[in-house]
């Protein structure tokens, strides 16, 4: 149905404040409520750390935000500005692992969530500004891609590394600022509903005014959206060594991070394929909606709820195809 | 969010040439080994060929070998299929996914073994 055709459905406003406030009582639920349904949208982040314990070493991170059940995990690399790139390593529930060199070790931490860790020598490994992608797939709904790299501020010259600060800020403003804008209009559009609630409707059937009915298909997506927001983040962990720079990244200072959100215009409808297993709220997108204010810096989890893995027993090669190793 | 769009099927006699295309959106292309595969009526989805992230390597299913080539244009972001000396045996729809399936076993496969896929498009040899 178009939106022009449920226009007139509203009265026009009364003049005087009486009228002006039934209009915006009228308008600003549906204005709410279309906030709360697409609050939920699929996400992929991805977080790319770079290890100040560890030679040149990579952690990214990447994980998906959505209702669906994850099918497949495919992690990529490549070079900047377009250049080709190759697969790492793709993960399937029930298939199993493969990875292929320089990664050395791919494992679910979560039912959303993985971690890669590459080899920190050798030609073919990352350098700073290697660009990571993660693909979550989720059938049939759809898939979802996201990429990250090291900001440029990373590259080996530099006498000791930025801190995370000012990423991690800027990244967090935004999950704080839309998370909070939702929040908060979803919360106001319950207590409109409530507020309708007590208001006396003369001549009608008390059947056809009850606000249980609106109140439970506002608050619907709101708690559909606030759970896609409990997913916690996938993580591929990478370590690397740039292979065309004869310097080691510095040691010493904090590791940082690189968020890249990308947002997805479809939300997948599918119930989680680990549904019984507990979420564990962990990421700092998380503690908003759980009103944990004081761990909006805290890192992602590195264990999860223990999920049963499937790799192939004859190793990571054991399965390699005809196009052999990538 | 991910689209793979196929293209180029249609109605062809044997021996006749379609060429299948697969126009990706929404992922770094170029990053990804691209596969077709194809599903007949009555049958299971069947691995066709696979061709890996730069176009240096592809491979065939023996069914399809000297009649069947797979390319892609990382620049144009889309992935075809040649396909000459058709036959009624190769009657499907035809699927554009992202993934190489011998990464897990081509035995029972399903479209969810891959990252990505398309809607398909039919291809049908007959006279």
């Known amino acids: 149905m178009r939106t022009e055709a449920q226009v007139p459905a509203l009265q026009p406003p009364e003049p005087g404040l009486e009228g002006a406030m039934g209009h915006r009582t009228l308008v600003l639920p549906w204005v709410l409520l279309t906030l709360c349904v697409t609050a939920g949208t699929p996400e992929v982040w991805v977080q790319v750390r770079m290890e100040a314990t560890e030679l040149s070493s990579f952690t990214i991170r990447c994980g998906f935000l959505g209702s669906g059940s994850i099918s497949l995990v495919t992690v990529s690399w490549g070079g900047p500005n377009g250049a080709g790139g190759t697969t790492l390593a793709v993960l399937h529930p029930e298939r199993g692992i493969r990875q292929w060199a320089p990664a050395r070790q791919a494992r679910w931490e979560t039912q959303s969530s993985i971690s890669l860790i590459l080899e920190g020598s050798g030609a073919s490994s990352p350098c700073a500004n290697t660009t990571f992608c993660c693909k979550f797939a989720s059938f049939p709904e759809g898939s979802w891609e996201a990429c990250g790299s090291l900001p440029p501020s990373s590259d080996p010259g530099l006498s000791a590394p930025p801190t995370p600060a000012p990423i991690l800020r800027a990244d967090l403003a935004g999950i704080l600022g839309v998370s909070g804008v939702l929040l908060f209009g979803c919360v106001y559009l319950l207590h409109l509903l409530r507020r309708h609630k007590h208001r006396p409707a003369p001549r009608l059937q008390p059947s056809r005014t009850s606000p249980q009915a609106p109140r439970a298909r506002a608050w619907a997506p709101s708690q559909a959206s606030q759970a896609a927001l409990h997913v916690p983040y996938a993580t591929i962990n990478t370590s690397c060594r740039p292979a065309t720079l004869d310097t080691a990244h510095p040691h010493g200072g904090p590791s940082w991070w690189a968020s890249l959100p990308t947002h997805a215009a479809h939300r997948p409808q599918g119930p989680a394929a680990w549904a019984s297993t507990p979420i564990p709220a962990r990421g700092s997108f998380v503690s908003v909606e759980n009103g944990l204010y004081a761990q909006a810096g805290e890192r992602p989890p590195h264990t999860g709820p223990g999920l049963t893995l499937f790799p192939d027993p004859r190793g990571p090669r054991a399965m390699e195809g005809p196009l052999g190793v990538r | 969010e991910v689209q793979l769009v196929e293209s180029g099927g249609g109605l062809v006699q044997p021996g006749g040439s379609l060429r299948l295309s697969c126009a990706a959106s929404?992922?770094?292309?170029?990053?990804?080994?691209m596969s077709w595969v194809r599903q007949a009526p009555g049958k299971g989805l069947e691995w066709v060929s696979t061709i890996n992230s730069n176009g240096g390597r592809t491979s065939y299913v023996d069914s399809v070998k000297g009649r069947f080539t797979i390319s892609r244009d990382n620049t144009k972001n889309t992935l075809y299929l040649q396909m000459n000396s058709l036959k009624p045996e190769d009657t499907a729809v035809y699927y554009c996914?992202?993934?190489?399936?011998?990464?897990?076993?081509?035995?029972?496969?399903?479209?969810?073994?891959?990252?990505?896929w398309g809607q398909g498009t039919q291809v049908t040899v007959s006279s």
């Open positions: 929404g992922f770094t292309f170029s990053y990804y080994d």
């Open positions: 996914v992202e993934g190489d399936p011998h990464n897990f076993g081509l035995e029972n496969l399903s479209l969810r073994d891959f990252g990505s």
